[in-house]
Amino acid sequence: SDGGAQDCCLKYSQRKIPAKVVRSYRKQEPSLGCSIPAILFLPRKRSQAELCADPKELWVQQLMQHLDKTPTPRKPVQGCRKDRGVPKNGKKGKGCKRTEQSQTPKGP
């Protein structure tokens, strides 16, 4: 392994993020080498950092569901962070799954 945990979100942010400023999210999964499960929310402004959140929290689940059913104009990106450079914190995003749904909105 090339450093393992340093590529992962290690603790959940205490901050929350308003739904309307989030573009998409990706999942960090322990099965792929990270120590904790996490949801990383990507802000619409690319200059802003991702927010690492606990997938068990109600507000996180609400925001994920909202994003799951909202089609985005862009095609889903294969792999992790392929559409942007390595962020300032140096995380490469190993052990994550992109979930930018753009085909089938799940509205009622």
Epitope: K16, I17, P18, A19, K20, K56, E57, L58, W59, Q61, Q62, L63, Q65, H66, K69, T70, K106, G107, P108
Partner: antibody, heavy 117, light 108 residues
Amino acid sequence: EVQLLESGGGLVQPGGSLRLSCAASGFTFNSYSMSWVRQAPGKGLEWVSAISMEGYSKSYADSVKGRFTISRDNSKNTLYLQMNSLRAEDTAVYYCARGYGYYFDVWGQGTLVTVSS
Amino acid sequence: SYELTQPLSVSVALGQTARITCGGDSIGSQYASWYQQKPGQAPVLVIYDDNERPSGIPERFSGSNSGNTATLTISRAQAGDEADYYCSSWDMDAVNVFGGGTKLTVLG
């Protein structure tokens, strides 16, 4: 058919307790957050409490915080509301509602709770 | 605590357009939903995510949300639209609030 069926309402004295149940059917229960919403006679809707998919995360309206407890049993497809220290102003029809994102897409028909001596 | 303010009643002539407002501090930064409730019945979702319509809800129902006001618009009002209407939104802490409700009367 997607359905929510509340039960457990009735007449209770002030200071008493009651446990409401909501049986869910026709959908994958553990894939949705759930809420309780109440409506006092002749009044508007008031959100009471919400719970995350697996029951880890809960939120409450200020008016019931410390007195009511929301819970769920995903193996039984059932949502609960334990109501303690009941007051006259808790008298209402209590609805359970399925949450998806930022809205309620399925509602039960409600169960009436009357708090009176 | 956060409050949403609706007019107690709104009247509209048959076939005309009704607008029901929902005022709240920066409600435009959150997602608003609207529910229709007829006497003795459970509420029914008519608008979600500010301006989306669930399947089965007529196109005559539409929504908007910006600044401090969310608005439900019912065009070509019909007698069957007579009901109480409630707006709702969630804050970032997963706490929900409903407006006080608006009784819509269709005249004629």
